[in-house]
């Protein structure tokens, strides 16, 4: 969380941002809040990106003002116009690109004063893994697959019964480049699995951490997966 203070004459307003991550090809949110003003027409929101000379986005007098928007963001940005009055200056970024990563500044002007705060925005690809029993294999084998990751993640297997065990010798992980030549499909195979045990396939890069669990018993198979974005710090 980053909290910024700005000075305009003797007046400053508090602006708060939260570091976040965007999934390539999907829509992302750059979070920013500020002390609200009672009049929408008095609020100006400017989003800037380090190293970019044009504006990322500008909102003033109750509407978007995009005459000074940089080409790389054309047609890809929007604020939540109905939420500006309550202090939400967050930016929706459509079709996140790898090059959208960087430091952004959320700059706010209201009748109370001005303020700004920076945020770090990471971009990459991350997806939920799915763990299945590989019935085609000669021995009891688990297969963990996740369709889109970037940068290349690490894959670690763990088990509930053999906590702390190192499965690197009995697992094999491969990365297959997807058709857009950036993201990769992750496939990891774990051999010699035992029944009545819960196994976890953990995929992690510097943006996200995802886990796929599978519990195999004689009577049923239970699966669960979750994904967590890393380094979401407020500013």
């Amino acid at each position: 969380l980053i909290i910024g203070f700005g000075i305009s004459g003797r007046h400053s307003i508090t602006v708060t941002t939260v570091a976040s991550a965007g999934n390539i090809g999907e829509d992302g949110i750059l979070s920013c809040t500020f002390e609200p003003d009672i009049k929408l027409s008095d609020i100006v929101i400017q989003w800037l990106k380090e190293g970019v000379l044009g504006l990322v986005h500008e909102f003033k007098e109750g509407k978007d003002e995009l005459s000074e928007q940089d080409e790389m963001f054309r047609g890809r940005t929007a604020v939540f116009a109905d939420q500006v009055i309550v202090g939400n200056a967050s930016l929706r970024l459509k079709n996140v690109q790898l090059t959208d990563a960087g430091t952004y500044k959320c700059y706010i002007i209201t009748s109370k004063g001005k303020g700004n705060a920076n945020l770090e925005y990471k971009t990459g690809a991350f997806s939920m893994p799915e763990v299945n029993v590989d019935y085609n294999a000669s021995s009891e084998t688990l297969r963990c697959e996740a369709p889109r990751w970037f940068p290349q993640p690490t894959v670690v297997w763990a088990s509930q019964v053999d906590q702390g065990a190192n499965f690197s010798e009995v697992s094999n992980t491969s990365f297959e480049l997807n058709s857009e030549n950036v993201t990769m499909k992750v496939v990891s195979v774990l051999y010699n699995v035992t029944i009545n045990n819960t196994y976890s396939c953990m995929i992690e890069n510097d943006i996200a951490k995802a886990t796929g669990d599978i519990k195999v018993t004689e009577s049923e198979i239970k699966r669960r997966s979750h994904l967590q974005l890393l380094n979401s710090k407020a500013s």
Epitope: L48, E50, G51, V52, L53, G54, E68, K105
Partner: antibody, heavy 121, light 107 residues
Framework: EVQLLESGGGLVQPGGSLRLSCAAS????????MHWVRQAPGKGLEWVSA????????YYADSVKGRFTISRDISKNTLYLQMNSLRAEDTAVYYC??????????????WGQGTTVTVSS | DIQMTQSPSSLSASVGDRVTITCRAS??????LAWYQQKPGKAPKLLIY???NLATGVPSRFSGSGSGTDFTLTISSLQPEDFATYYC?????????FGGGTKVEIK
């Protein structure tokens, strides 16, 4: 010491070409946007062109658009201005300048000494 | 493009005088405004950025004020080395326009 040093100016005929260079030292070149600004004899300052830190975005004044090209070589810490189809009104001292501020919202805090371009037949 | 209009275009003043130069933008530039000093045969020097912030190494007798469309550069007590031409410049629009300049001469 932070420094910018221009070179490449000279006398050129109308319609001719010239390439200006600006060697940067004393700062991390690829984190700063850079500008070219010119000043005709006895006149005020006129912004010519700008380039982002990465070199990915370029901007030009209407008076030079389509004729001038700004570029940078990060490995050589050098900024360039390729000037084609030169006209008499391009005669000026050309300065390179560094943009202050990470987001391009501030002024130009470091300037070179300038290089003179004269377009005349 | 945003037009920047400076006034006066020239002024005569004495050492110790308080000098005020104004700059008006044709549309709002918020506080994205800088002031420069230029002496004959020399490159411009940044004095003020973000409308009110003093650049590194600039004496405190220089100050900037304003936001939106109207800006002022003030020299509280003119010194002999301050006789020069002063320019305003906006950074809001990616056309980075300069004002026409104000020449400060010795009375």
């Amino acid at each position: 010491e932070v420094q910018l040093l221009e070179s490449g100016g000279g006398l050129v005929q109308p319609g001719g070409s010239l390439r200006l260079s600006c060697a940067a030292s004393g700062f991390t070149f690829n984190t700063h946007a850079m500008h070219w600004v010119r000043q005709a004899p006895g006149k005020g300052l006129e912004w010519v062109s700008a380039i982002s830190g990465s070199g990915g975005s370029t901007y030009y004044a209407d008076s030079v658009k389509g004729r001038f090209t700004i570029s940078r070589d990060i490995s050589k810490n050098t900024l360039y201005l390729q000037m084609n189809s030169l006209r008499a009104e391009d005669t000026a001292v050309y300065y390179c300048a560094r943009l202050l501020g990470r987001f391009g919202e501030y002024g130009m805090d470091v300037w070179g000494q300038g290089t003179t371009v004269t377009v005349s037949s | 493009d945003i037009q920047m209009t400076q006034s006066p275009s020239s002024l005569s003043a004495s050492v110790g005088d308080r000098v005020t130069i104004t700059c008006r933008a044709s549309q709002t530039v918020y506080t994205w405004l800088a002031w420069y000093q230029q002496k004959p045969g020399k490159a411009p020097k940044l004095l003020i950025y973000d409308a009110t912030n003093l650049a590194t190494g600039v004496p405190s007798r220089f100050s900037g004020s304003g936001s939106g469309t109207d800006f002022t550069l003030t020299i509280s007590s003119l010194q002999p080395e301050d006789f020069a031409t002063y320019y305003c410049q906006q950074s809001y629009s990616t056309s980075w326009t300069f004002g026409g300049g104000t020449k400060v001469e010795i009375k």
